[in-house]
Structures are given as structure tokens and as C-alpha cells.
């Protein structure tokens, strides 16, 4: 997955940091404070979108070749930017009950970008 | 069974240098920030470096900036620490140790920890 | 950088005795306090995080209280293994991460 450079419009990985504070999350949230979630952002032509390294899947990209050559259902479909490997990341927060918990939640950090 | 394994200590000359390794197993190894900590004879323990799950955060002991070098491999389960222009007082166990938080882009603490590898720095 | 300071440096205890170790802060680090338990040629072994949460595998009887600049650790009832040197360890600002100087529990 590419990395948004500011030169390129085609579809990257963009860092962004989400503060907890920000969103009003602080309060049950005990850490981090922080993180970077980053976003997907950035065009999907055909000749990318049909790439199988820039695709989300495997499924994506044959869809795609459909797509490229105008078959039916799939030619007016457009490719969209999103995030084809995320992280998990561990946080501290208070449940109901004030306890602290520890905690690994999936799919928390977008890590690599492709053309679904 | 999550385990570490350091190795690469020994008896090694002031000035000279040493390189040591960690060997990860039974966890996710890419998911986790490393460090490294030691122990001199009959002392506490002094946290030297660590290095955060892609390598993005990197930090060192006073004691030892400029000096030493950490990195990691994931793609090898490794924890590596380069140390350079070796003192009398780098002499202590050196640990190896698993960060408790998944992913942070900074330290919080240790849950699992290796045996340690000796480095003894004389002339 | 966050100095550490546990209190006391040693001290004596029975089998059964309800002991407090205490550690200090040199600035307010909310609750990002750990603490940890070493015996003799052994690795050191995550007790608490959180200030007062318990790792698991650890007995009950091990618990930690405190917040922003005072903490402590306390053992209820103690067991003839608990007999070592215990750490604090401050994770609010770092690097550096900090330990305190320890505290060497040992049988009266």
C-alpha cells in the first residue's frame, strides 16, 4: 500500500493522529491519549483498482477486469479507496462498573490502502 | 508459550563493541514494542532503549545515547541492541522484555521478559 | 525526566503480615504506575499495571492503589514466596521509562 506523499492522487494510506480528548472519549478512556488511525484516501482508476498488490482482494481485482472491459453488471461500479489491512491496538479504559480493563481491539489502525 | 531467548553477551574490552539479540516466540512479534533493560551486580533495574511495534519510536537511557543502537526484524521474531564504545559501567544482565500495550505508538511497561544475557565490559 | 522513589528501601516481615510498599513520583503521572516482583537470579515479573490492576496469573492477595503522585503496593497476607525485591515503573512519560530503586522484602 502507498503512502500519501502530496504527489500522487491515487489511492494511499494518509497519517492521521485521533486524539481521545477531541472526541470527548477522555473521560472513559485511560490510555493512550491518543493514536494514529490514518485514513484512505485517493483516486482508483481501472488500470490500479485492477492491480491484485493495490486491490483489497483477490475478488476485487477480477471484478475489476470486469469492470475495465464494460461487462455487465459491473461496468458502472466504481472502485473505492479503503483500508485493506488494519491493526489491532491495546487500550486501558473504565467499564461500567469504574474497573480498569486492558483490552486488544481489532481493526483499530488502518495500515496498508487498496482499491476495493 | 510465549518466550525470549537473549543471547550475544560476553566479556568484552572498554571501547570495544558487542551486539545482542533476542529471539521472540508465541506472540504476535510486530504487534509489540521491545526494550531492553539491565541489571548491574546488586543493583535496580535501568531501562536502556525501546523500540516501538514498527519501529516509528526509538528511545535510549541518557547513560547510553549515542552509544548504543537498537532495531528490530519482524519479519525474523528479532530484538537487536548494537553497543558501541563499551564502558566499566555497562557491565549488568541485560533483559529483554515484551511491551504490555499492542501497537502504541510509545512505551508503557513489561509483562514478559527473557532470562538475560551477561555482558561484562573489563580490561 | 519522572524520578522514582520507593519507600522503604528494605524491610522485615512474617509469614501472614499485611505489608505497604510506597512509591513516589517526582510529578504527577495519573495512574501510568506498574509495578513488578524479582527473585534472587530470576527475571523480574509484572505484578500490577494501571496502578491497580491486577496481571493475570498473579494471587489476590497482591494489590495496588493510588493515583497522580502516591502509590502503593499491598500484600494482604504474606506467603513465604512472596520474599523479594519489588519495582515501581512510571509509563506517563516516555522514553525514558523510569523504575524505582527497588524494595527488598525479606522474613523477620
Known amino acids: 500500500g502507498l503512502e500519501c506523499d502530496g504527489k500522487v492522487n491515487i489511492c494511499c494510506k494518509k497519517q492521521f493522529f485521533v486524539s481521545f480528548k477531541d472526541i470527548g472519549w477522555n473521560d472513559w478512556i485511560i490510555a493512550p491519549s491518543g493514536y494514529h488511525a490514518n485514513y484512505c484516501e485517493g483516486e482508483c482508476p481501472s488500470h490500479i483498482a485492477g492491480t491484485s498488490g493495490s486491490s483489497l482482494s483477490f475478488h476485487s481485482t477480477v471484478i475489476n477486469h470486469y469492470r475495465m472491459r464494460g461487462h455487465s453488471p459491473f461496468a458502472n461500479l466504481k472502485s473505492c479507496c479503503v483500508p485493506t489491512k488494519l491493526r489491532p491496538m491495546s487500550m486501558l479504559y473504565y467499564d461500567d462498573g469504574q474497573n480498569i480493563i486492558k483490552k486488544d481491539i481489532q481493526n483499530m489502525i488502518v495500515e496498508e490502502c487498496g482499491c476495493s | 508459550e510465549v518466550q525470549l531467548v537473549e543471547s550475544g553477551g560476553g566479556l568484552v574490552q572498554p571501547g570495544r563493541s558487542l551486539r545482542l539479540s533476542c529471539a521472540a516466540s508465541?506472540?504476535?512479534?510486530?504487534?509489540?514494542?521491545m526494550h531492553w533493560v539491565r541489571q548491574a551486580p546488586g543493583k535496580g533495574l535501568e531501562w536502556v532503549s525501546g523500540?516501538?511495534?514498527?519501529?516509528?519510536?526509538?528511545g535510549y537511557a541518557d547513560s547510553v545515547k549515542g552509544r548504543f543502537t537498537i532495531s528490530r526484524d519482524n519479519a525474523k521474531n528479532s530484538l537487536y541492541l548494537q553497543m558501541n564504545s563499551l564502558r566499566a559501567e555497562d557491565t549488568a544482565l541485560y533483559y529483554c522484555?515484551?511491551?504490555?500495550?499492542?501497537?502504541?505508538?510509545?512505551?508503557?511497561?513489561?509483562?514478559?521478559w527473557g532470562q538475560g544475557t551477561t555482558v561484562t565490559v573489563s580490561s | 525526566d519522572i524520578q522514582m522513589t520507593q519507600s522503604p528501601s528494605s524491610l522485615s516481615a512474617s509469614v501472614g503480615d499485611r505489608v505497604t510498599i510506597t512509591c513516589r513520583a517526582s510529578?504527577?503521572?495519573?495512574?501510568?504506575l506498574n509495578w513488578y516482583q524479582q527473585k534472587p537470579g530470576k527475571a523480574p515479573k509484572l505484578l500490577i499495571y494501571?496502578?491497580?490492576s491486577l496481571q493475570s496469573g498473579v494471587p489476590s492477595r497482591f494489590s495496588g492503589s493510588g493515583s497522580g503522585t502516591d502509590f502503593t503496593l499491598t500484600i494482604s497476607s504474606l506467603q513465604p514466596e512472596d520474599f523479594a525485591t519489588y519495582y515501581c515503573?512510571?509509563?506517563?512519560?516516555?522514553?525514558?521509562?523510569?523504575f524505582g530503586q527497588g524494595t527488598r522484602l525479606e522474613i523477620k
Open positions: 522484555a515484551k511491551d504490555i500495550m499492542g501497537n502504541w505508538d510509545y512505551f508503557y511497561g513489561m509483562d514478559v
Open positions: 508465541g506472540f504476535t512479534f510486530d504487534d509489540y514494542a
Open positions: 523500540i516501538s511495534w514498527n519501529s516509528g519510536s526509538i
Open positions: 510529578q504527577s503521572i495519573s495512574s501510568y
Open positions: 494501571a496502578a491497580s
Open positions: 515503573q512510571q509509563s506517563y512519560s516516555t522514553p525514558p521509562i523510569t
